[in-house]
């Protein structure tokens, strides 16, 4: 269980005083049962550990992904785990470290030479064998072979937000993902009522920009739950 992570939960790196920024302590681990170490395949207990809970990958760092730390773990307990290096097992692109992507359950390099064909195949595979289309658009999506070598501009195909230029995030568009603008004040945003609901969106929105949060528009408070409009608002 997750709790075995915390059997020895002392923090050796004492936090700084109020307002100070802490360093990023390493993912040092010591042996013990029950926990899948984020970067590999061995069961270990994590010591000196500060679990950072999350609901989706965007809440974690660029070198992390969001998942349950135990196999078959409680969906209500998800934390940021270290990304998986090349040749490690994966279930989605975000699990693989930047410069890699998930192909056939393994993190592989997204280097320029073989990236284009493989990622095209992977995106098609990701959505199963149903080859139907929506509004005449094909599910097969080709990525530029220059990806990962320059930051994607708006509309560029991406795997994760770190592939996109500043002010953009990587969001689903049909059955691929492209760089879209981070939402500004007053723009409509999506408030996910339950974990994982964002996975159903064909046209996914970015999150609200810094200093903003996705909240119900004041004049929509009386509306029914299903019709409530959320917008990015300042605190």
């Amino acid at each position: 269980t997750l709790n075995s992570v915390l059997n020895s939960n002392a923090i050796k790196n004492l936090p700084p005083p109020l307002g100070g920024a802490a360093g990023h302590p390493g993912s040092a681990v010591s042996a013990a049962p029950g926990i899948l170490y984020p970067g590999g395949n061995k069961y270990q207990t994590i010591d000196n550990y500060q679990p950072y809970p999350c609901a989706e990958d965007e809440e974690c760092g660029t070198d992390e992904y969001c998942a349950s730390p135990t196999r078959g773990g409680d969906a209500g307990v998800q934390i940021c785990l270290a990304c998986r290096k090349r040749r490690k097992r994966c279930m989605r692109h975000a699990m693989c470290c930047p410069g890699n992507y998930c192909k056939n359950g393994i993190c592989v390099s997204s280097d320029q030479n073989h990236f284009r064909g493989e990622i095209e195949e992977t995106i098609t595979e990701s959505f199963g064998n149903d080859h139907s289309t929506l509004d005449g658009y094909s599910r097969r999506t080709t990525l530029s072979s220059k990806m990962y070598h320059t930051k994607g501009q708006e509309g560029s195909v991406c795997l994760r937000s770190s592939d996109c230029a500043s002010g953009l995030c990587c969001a689903r568009h049909f059955w691929s993902k492209i760089c879209k603008p981070v939402l500004k004040e007053g723009q409509v945003c999506t408030k996910h009522r339950r974990k994982g609901s964002h996975g159903l969106e064909i046209f996914q929105r970015c999150y609200c920009g810094e200093g903003l949060s996705c909240r119900i528009q004041k004049d929509h408070h009386q509306a029914s739950n299903s019709s409530r409009l959320h917008t990015c608002q300042r605190h």
């Epitope: 950072y52 609901a55 965007e58 809440e59 974690c60 760092g61 307990v77 810094e210």
Partner: nanobody, 125 residues
Framework: EVQLVESGGGLVQAGGSLRLSCAAS????????MGWFRQAPGKEREFVAA????????VYADSVKGRFAISRDNAKSTVYLQMNSLKPEDTAVYYC??????????????????WGQGTQVTVSS
């Protein structure tokens, strides 16, 4: 820069309850995870509980699971720690911590970068 102020600590008898609060200011509260840590005299600081930015994921230390509950109110920029069935071994200074917001703020790793000054909790037997 984030500022965190804890309150709600005090002296309570074993078996009693306390509710700690941590008010945050200085950045969009709803963008980052929040955690509670504690440090008993002569011991190292240890993790107690944490909650994701959307409140959909919570995690607890073994020693407090089933007794403590973490929650947050994003509208009030406040995180809470409800502590029930308190034991003498829960005596410590309790610290509130705010995460760095992860990749949304350009970080390679999501970590607790901001800390409050702490509030004393004493449980007498």
């Amino acid at each position: 820069e984030v500022q965190l102020v804890e309150s709600g600590g005090g002296l309570v008898q074993a078996g009693g309850s306390l509710r700690l609060s941590c008010a945050a200011s200085g950045r969009t509260f709803s963008s980052y995870a929040m955690g509670w840590f504690r440090q008993a005299p002569g011991k190292e600081r240890e993790f107690v509980a944490a909650i994701s930015s959307s409140a959909s994921s919570t995690v607890y230390a073994d020693s407090v699971k089933g007794r403590f509950a973490i929650s947050r109110d994003n509208a009030k920029s406040t995180v809470y720690l409800q502590m029930n069935s308190l034991k003498p071994e829960d005596t410590a200074v309790y610290y509130c911590a705010a995460g760095n917001g992860g990749r949304k703020y350009g970080h390679h790793r999501a970590r607790y970068d901001y800390w409050g000054q702490g509030t004393q909790v004493t449980v007498s037997s």
